[in-house]
Amino acid sequence: YDFTNCDFEKIKAAYLSTISKDLITYMSGTKSTEFNNTVSCSNRPHCLTEIQSLTFNPTAGCASLAKEMFAMKTKAALAIWCPGYSETQINATQAMKKRRKRKVTTNKCLEQVSQLQGLWRRFNRPLLKQQ
């Protein structure tokens, strides 16, 4: 999906009001020094591409993020504020139902959510290169 035509400001508002708080709840008890951000993004569409990938695609050691509250709210925000996003997700959702696993918070998941916080931070404030 090409995130170029999303309403970035509306997504940002949704992130600040709810999604960010759910991410903090998920990470509660984790030291702020524990994880270094290794995934980066260069502009808002790129950030949303990386956010979608880390939130919804199962990875080795962390297969369960898609059912978390922050993930459901992320999906809703993208569906509302990115034209045509919902249609592209129907097949992905059906595939997800088939491979649903028991919800377990692993250290790998905590690291992944820490990366998500970093991606959202850069989505909110892409550091523009000096002219």
Partner: antibody, heavy 119, light 107 residues
Framework: QVQLVQSGAEVKKPGASVKVSCKAS????????IEWVRQAPGQGLEWMGI????????YYAQKFQGRVTLTADKSTSTAYMELSSLRSEDSAVYYC????????????WGQGTTLTVSS | DIQMTQSPSSLSASVGDRVTITCRAS??????LVWYQQKPGKAPQLLIY???NLQSGVPSRFSGSGSGTQFTLTISSLQPEDFATYYC?????????FGTGTKLEIK
């Protein structure tokens, strides 16, 4: 807990340079942008520039471009602000600040470094 | 660059009063606005981010509203520790700029 500790007060002559340090602790230094803000006596806050400690990317306010240099030392979790060709109008308190978890504000500030420029 | 204008520049009020400070942006900044409180000789402290979100640990008597170019900070019932200078700042794009400040004094 998160802390930004700045270097001590400086007295400089016009035309000289100053380098202020900002040592960060209590968080992953390279994950967050560091910004520099100054405040002249009795005046408001003035944004100077920003650095990404991970990449070294910087952005300076037009007013300071060519005179200010922001750097970061990942090994010591320290950010630096160097201001050259000092003039009396540069007398101010200089603050470093860390962006928040959401990137929508500054949530922690240094205690400030007072710079006096006088002949 | 985006200019931020605050009004009033100073304000006298009494403990228990409801106070409103306004910040105007020279162009649309959506909800990308922050409010800080600063006391003499101290660094600013974050009150509100994203125009309306209360920073953790900040008393609920502080609230923010507005979007686009017009924003307000409201203190519902002034407490003695609220007498300070308040600044808005846009977080829309680089370069960031601060408002001119509002000094809140005891009447």
């Amino acid at each position: 807990q998160v802390q930004l500790v700045q270097s001590g007060a400086e007295v400089k002559k016009p035309g000289a340079s100053v380098k202020v340090s900002c040592k960060a602790s209590g968080y992953a230094f390279t994950n967050y942008l560091i910004e520099w803000v100054r405040q002249a006596p009795g005046q408001g806050l003035e944004w100077m520039g920003i650095i990404n400690p991970e990449s070294g990317d910087t952005y300076y306010a037009q007013k300071f471009q060519g005179r200010v240099t922001l750097t970061a030392d990942k090994s010591t979790s320290t950010a630096y602000m160097e201001l050259s060709s000092l003039r009396s109008e540069d007398s101010a308190v200089y603050y470093c600040a860390k962006e928040s978890l959401t990137g929508s504000s500054y949530d922690y500030w240094g205690q400030g470094t007072t710079l006096t420029v006088s002949s | 660059d985006i200019q931020m204008t605050q009004s009033p520049s100073s304000l006298s009020a009494s403990v228990g009063d409801r106070v409103t400070i306004t910040c105007r942006a020279s162009e649309n900044i959506y909800s990308n606005l922050v409010w800080y409180q600063q006391k003499p000789g101290k660094a600013p402290q974050l009150l509100i981010y994203g125009a309306r979100n209360l920073q953790s640990g900040v008393p609920s008597r502080f609230s923010g509203s507005g979007s686009g170019t017009q924003f307000t900070l409201t203190i519902s019932s002034l407490q003695p520790e609220d007498f300070a200078t308040y600044y808005c700042q846009h977080f829309y794009e680089t370069p960031l700029t601060f408002g001119t400040g509002t000094k809140l004094e005891i009447k």
